[in-house]
Interface confidence: low
């Protein structure tokens, strides 16, 4: 999947299996990724997991879990708020369209989180105050958490090397530069260019993550999904100069 | 797909603070972790075959439900972890009811916090 | 006292097998790796391999794939590492040692250490 | 050759602090939580020292402890004395691969 970190780094991943979003004193996510496609590098979101920890008179610990077709609007145990505690509802689950978008407010730390489905995948979107990202309590040992340290470059792709690779160039020519060799070769780098300028006008890294969707799947969900993305920034990124990423400085994994 | 002994573990670890045999908890929590442990390293056994990991945790598991007298079978819901050292402490004296501290204790000290954003999306 | 307690010392030629006995008491046996590790004179350490007791599954280190075999026996509470096709450079102490239990993988309790010289 | 770097050698007098590193790959070490370190004096066997990178076995003194940054895991031993001269080994498990350092002889000069 494409990640934006905490630092406003872009990058595209291609980690498999379950991996760590975020890990802080007060939450944890996990997400799950796998193959678009039978031999394919690039992977996208098929699992969410969300672990509200425990949290003094406030919350109880609760856990939300997505997957593919299936996005609900509860805790995993039915439960729509942080249970039975005085602060209960500082913890808040929202459902905006039902299976496609939930909202999950945790206001004891000032944190919101946006869910949703697009096609067959997961995105997911926070807005977090640095003071509970940095809230872990030994840094040293920390393992590798996506959202913070991005990355690892063994598990990065060059999508924008791709792109400007595959520019003007009809389907058959990004073939050998697809990390998806059975990518459908019926869709042309220009459909997916005005697929991609429909929704997303502004040729920013949303915009060319479009593309490189479009042409490693061929599936257009992937299209509503940076535009979903980008909307998700819009709402929740403090930073409104920051909206729009254009350009990836060459980056080394953030540890 | 791979082995995911790796996230079993950091789920328990998570669920129980890493802690072997905690004193503080209560059996039936830590019994109910472990079961959850146990069900999570059932579900990807069939790919951790020779994993070092996995069979010392398959083993860890047995070993430390009989230390607590655990039974295989009951509530396998996530324990609760350990009351979180707050950010900002949200035991401060106000007048306000107590719903109001959790809606405000994470920027006690400053009222408008530095925001960070994360996203994860497409492929 | 969790204790492993190793066989003695070995001389072998050549070409021979050697197997190492390591015998666990003061713990439950099947709850435990048990982990193999060799030290050649003046060198350092060097993994060879693990065996689940309770399961009977082996992870090998790669480079002695097909020579080594490990084995336990749960009613005696003993591990054993055979080494086959010995060579000069397999002279080493070998330990056995226990792995640590539940999402931790790390040496806790150590053998002694069992000398084999292989010479002609 | 150890895929996991060690120093030959430190040294320093007692009451000082050393520190021994230990470097391996993102795979190795970078991404590994299950680092541990070894004592092991002349003619015996080792002895767990830490584990999961920084916790320590009950019965180990707490001027020794553990870290990571990076590709790279140190141990640290404060306040030095003279039954801490001794080989230390660094290893790592990550996914199959178990790995050990060349290992680090500390003086105490």
């Known amino acids: 999947p494409h990640l934006r970190t905490f630092t406003d780094r872009f990058q595209t991943c291609k980690v498999q299996g379950a991996w760590p979003l975020i890990d802080n004193n007060y939450l944890n996510v996990q997400v799950t990724n796998t193959p678009v496609l039978p031999g394919s590098a690039a992977t996208a979101t098929s699992k969410l997991t969300i672990i509200f920890k425990n949290f003094q008179e406030c919350v109880d610990q609760k856990v939300y879990q997505a997957e593919m077709d299936e996005l609900p609007a509860a805790f995993v145990d039915g439960s729509k708020n942080g249970g039975d505690k005085h602060g209960a509802n500082s913890l808040k689950i929202t459902e905006k369209v039902s299976g496609q978008h939930v909202e999950i407010r945790a206001k004891y730390i000032g944190t919101t989180i946006v869910v949703r489905q697009v096609g067959r995948y997961l995105t997911f979107a926070v807005r977090v105050p640095e003071e509970v990202v940095n809230a872990v309590e030994d840094w040293d040992s920390q393992g590798l958490y996506l959202c913070l340290r991005g990355c690892p470059l063994n598990q990065q792709i060059d999508f924008q090397a791709f792109h400007t690779n595959t520019e003007g160039t009809g389907a058959r020519r990004l073939a050998a530069a697809s990390p998806a060799p059975t990518a459908p070769e019926t869709f042309p780098y220009e459909t997916a260019v005005a697929k991609c300028k429909e929704k997303l006008p502004v040729e920013d890294l949303y915009y060319q993550a479009c593309v490189f969707d479009l042409l490693t799947t061929g599936d257009v969900n992937f299209t509503l999904a940076a535009y979903y993305a980008l909307e998700d920034v819009k709402m929740l990124h403090s930073n409104k100069d920051k909206l729009h990423l254009y350009e990836r400085t060459r980056d080394l994994p953030g540890r | 797909s791979p082995c995911k002994i790796l996230k079993c573990n950091s789920e328990f670890w998570s669920a129980t603070s890493g802690s072997h045999a905690p004193a503080s908890d209560d059996t039936p929590e830590f019994c109910a972790a472990l079961r959850s442990y146990a069900l999570c390293t059932r579900r990807t056994a069939r790919t951790c075959r020779g994993d070092l990991a996995y069979h010392s945790a398959v083993h860890g598991i047995e070993d430390l439900m009989s230390q607590h007298n655990c039974s295989k079978d009951g509530p396998t819901s996530q324990p609760r972890l350990h009351t979180l050292p707050p950010a900002g402490d949200s035991q401060e004296r106000s007048d306000s009811p107590e719903i109001c501290h959790c809606e405000k204790s994470f920027h006690k000290h400053s009222a408008t916090p530095n925001y960070t954003h994360c996203g994860l999306f497409g492929d | 006292e969790v204790q492993l307690v190793q066989s003695g010392a070995e001389v072998k030629k050549p070409g021979a097998s050697v197997k190492v006995s390591c015998k666990a008491s003061g713990y439950t046996f099947t709850s435990h790796g048990i982990s193999w590790v060799r030290q050649a004179p003046g060198q350092g350490l060097d993994w060879m391999g693990w065996i689940s007791p309770y399961s009977g599954n082996t992870n090998y280190a790669q480079k002695l794939q097909g020579r080594v075999t490990m084995t336990t026996d749960t009613s005696t509470s003993t591990a054993y590492m055979e080494l086959s096709s010995l060579r000069s450079e397999d002279t080493a102490v070998y330990y056995c040692a226990r792995v640590g239990s539940g999402p931790y993988y790390y040496m806790d309790v150590w053998g002694q250490g069992t000398l084999v010289t292989v010479s002609s | 050759q150890s895929a996991l770097t060690q120093p030959r050698s430190v040294s320093g007098s007692p009451g000082q602090s050393v520190t021994i590193s230990c470097t391996g790959t993102?795979?190795?070490?970078?991404?590994?939580?299950?680092v541990s370190w070894y004592q092991q004096h002349p003619g015996k066997a080792p002895k767990l020292m830490l584990y999961?990178?920084?916790k320590r076995p009950s019965g180990v003194p707490d001027r020794f402890s553990g870290s990571k940054s990076g590709n790279t895991a140190s141990l640290t031993i404060s306040g030095l004395q003279a039954e801490d001269e001794a080989d230390y080994y660094c290893?790592?498990?990550?996914?199959?691969?178990?790995?050990f350092g060349g290992g680090t002889k500390v003086t105490v000069l």
């Open positions: 290893h790592s498990y990550a996914g199959t691969d178990t790995l």
């Open positions: 993102s795979s190795s070490v970078g991404d590994s939580i299950y």
């Open positions: 999961d990178v920084t």
